[in-house]
């Protein structure tokens, strides 16, 4: 029996990220006896739910059960049956549901009620569905990347976990871009956080962190596009909108009712003499960039410095992990390399946006046209947001690391959320045992 492995003493947790454009289910696993150690939790599965975000089910709530089935069944397969009953399931909804709640709290409640009813039918320990705040979304994203990068570990390491990891214990900032909101979170250098709404205090593994965070609702890539279209159609002379953020030759008909459906476009709403308009792409990065900048109000700042819309932003400090749509978009555009300068990114975006739509479709035949058509806007938006919105410069650009996964776990708020809810990030540094429990007898 010398080398006979004992049954794995592991635990599992499930988090569903109910985003504005889609829902993803994440399964996490960790050794039961090392719960309080830093960096022991890792992702074993991601299942992307087929279909839109849950906020789109407002008129068809009865379809939510079927919508969640495939990924919940996948979780049933991945997690051993003996562990099902003790595996917690959490669903966190983000900005798509925040926007729905702004429109109608009753409708948002109804969607969450049906989600809860559906998830309660599985053999797991369902802990409820809730709309997380923008502040939580930012904070948990920051916790996730720093946990995975080993920044909370007090042991000094001579090696680097990931290629871009600096070997000091300075935490990384977190930049998260979703469809409906974007979050910026970091520890400022000796700077007072002038706005209490943006200040978070954490004590993690025996160390205090004063963290700045803000979530910009309506400034996720999808809602920013709706905002831009609503702003630009105001000054269109007819029902043709010549749009520099789409490729030359691209055409798409938009219903005005769809444009004004979201609370994000309310400030641009006006009575138009048509029910539909046609976007006609002209593919000009510079003009697209200028149009996007009009979404950021930088004329007013009640603090020593602001991002935009009068929101306090301290001076940027240290390295940043940019994830979610920051990563997906830049990955598609092949711009995630550490070696690509901001000037090079801008050059590539100019070329990409100027490419004719027919050419783009041929080059990326496997990509859905709806997504493909929006990469010019999304890439330009990311540059505008990071440079003019958050005040990154050509020099500080090299401190932005576009991250998809760290150590096999997706960068995003879900891991931090689960670590918090399962009390797996202790306030104090755990006492290290002389010997860890061996898996072998």
């Amino acid at each position: 029996t010398q080398n006979k492995a004992l049954p794995e003493n592991v635990k599992y947790g499930i988090v569903l990220d109910a985003g504005s454009s889609h829902t993803s289910l994440y399964i996490y696993k960790w050794p039961a006896e090392k719960e309080n150690d830093t960096g022991v939790v890792h992702q074993v599965e991601e299942c992307r739910v087929k279909g839109p975000g849950i906020s789109k089910f407002v008129q068809k709530v009865n379809a939510i059960g079927i919508y969640l089935t495939a990924c919940m069944e996948r979780a049933r397969e991945v997690i051993p049956r003996s562990q099902h009953q003790e595996t917690p399931v959490y669903l966190g909804a983000t900005a798509g549901m925040r926007l729905l709640r702004m429109e109608s709290e009753e409708l948002a409640d109804r969607v969450l009620d049906v989600v809860e009813r559906s998830l309660s039918n599985y053999p797991f320990d369902f802990q409820g569905a809730r709309i997380i705040t923008g502040q939580e979304e930012g904070a948990y994203g920051w916790i996730t990347i720093n946990y995975l990068l080993g920044k909370f570990s007090q042991k000094t390491r001579w090696f680097s976990i990931v290629p871009y990891e600096t070997n000091n214990q300075e935490t990384f900032g977190a930049l998260d871009l979703g469809g409906a909101s974007t979050q910026v979170t970091f520890v400022p250098q000796n700077q007072t956080i002038e706005s209490p709404d943006n200040a978070l205090q954490f004590r993690l593994y025996g160390k205090d962190y004063n963290v700045y965070t803000h979530s910009f609702l309506c400034y996720g890539k999808d809602q920013a596009l709706w905002q831009k279209l609503a702003k630009d159609i105001q000054v269109a002379s007819n029902e043709i909108l010549r749009d520099p953020c789409f490729h030359p030759g691209y055409k798409k008909v938009v219903n005005v009712s769809d444009l004004y459906k979201t609370p994000c476009t309310k400030r641009f709403e006006m009575t138009l003499p048509f029910q539909q308009f046609e976007i006609q792409g002209i593919g000009n990065y510079q003009q697209c960039h200028q149009s996007i900048l009009e979404l950021f109000n930088t004329s007013y700042c009640p603090y020593s410095q602001c991002a935009f819309n009068g929101i306090f932003l301290p001076p940027l400090q240290g390295d940043f992990g940019a994830f979610s749509a920051f990563y997906f978009v830049m990955k598609f555009l092949n711009l995630t390399s550490e070696k690509v300068s901001q000037e090079k990114v801008t050059e590539m975006m100019k070329k990409f946006c100027a490419q004719p739509w027919e050419e783009i479709k041929t080059s990326y035949a496997g990509v859905k046209e709806k997504y493909l058509s929006e990469y010019c806007f999304s890439g330009t938006y990311i540059l505008s947001l990071l440079l003019q919105g958050y005040h990154f410069t050509a020099d500080s650009w090299e401190h932005i690391h576009f991250i998809g996964k760290i150590q096999g776990s997706d960068a995003g708020w879900t891991l931090g959320y689960m670590l918090n809810l399962t009390n797996m990030i202790p306030a104090e540094q755990p006492l290290s045992t002389p010997l860890s429990h061996s898996t072998y007898v």
Epitope: R101, E105, D109, L112, D113, E116, R117, S120, G128, A129, R130, I131, T133
Partner: antibody, heavy 121, light 107 residues
Framework: QVQLVQSGAEVKKPGASVKVSCKAS????????MHWVRQAPGQGLEWMGR????????WYAQKFQGRVTMTRDTSTSTVYMELSSLRSEDTAVYYC??????????????WGQGTLVTVSS | EIVLTQSPGTLSLSPGERATLSCRAS???????LAWYQQKPGQAPRLLIY???NRHTGIPDRFSGSGSGTDFTLTISRLEPEDFAVYYC????????FGGGTKVEIK
Amino acid sequence: QVQLVQSGAEVKKPGASVKVSCKASGYTFKSYEMHWVRQAPGQGLEWMGRINPSVGSTWYAQKFQGRVTMTRDTSTSTVYMELSSLRSEDTAVYYCARGKREGGTEYLRKWGQGTLVTVSS
Amino acid sequence: EIVLTQSPGTLSLSPGERATLSCRASQSVASSYLAWYQQKPGQAPRLLIYGASNRHTGIPDRFSGSGSGTDFTLTISRLEPEDFAVYYCQQYHNAITFGGGTKVEIK
């Protein structure tokens, strides 16, 4: 569908305590706050406080602080309201009412049928 | 705490008529924090309007709410026999308070 079923009528002596229960069904119990509101005979509505069933935290109206205790039992999806040091003016119908989800607004969407508490020597 | 004053105390109207009920707050109330309830004898109150102007599920469109700041109104466009009841407004600002109620009775 959502149901809130309250315990039956009670007759109490002055100085005694009363504990009224409210059993919830048809939704995820921990997701919504529960409030208690009372109504004296022929009078208006008076808010007493609320409990968050998820964590058990409470918030009481100033008038009732020190005399009211709200608790919950998540295993039976039941909330309780105990009022001590009863006096005749506590004679009223006591209602539980389901409030908001976290982050929502404080209006009372669904009410129990009410429990009449009579305080008489 | 915010005091809500409802007027009139009693409103005597005939079926088919329009009813206008007023609720005045002692200090400004965010619109999203004002609601209206209907209560019939021997029954629990029922939510009609939330967020000052949003009709709760299943509430007929003859009921409408309006107002902002300190002055709010519940309007019943054409009274039906089942609408004769007591109506309460409610606000939330740290604590919940209710108005004293308006009784709508048959003339």
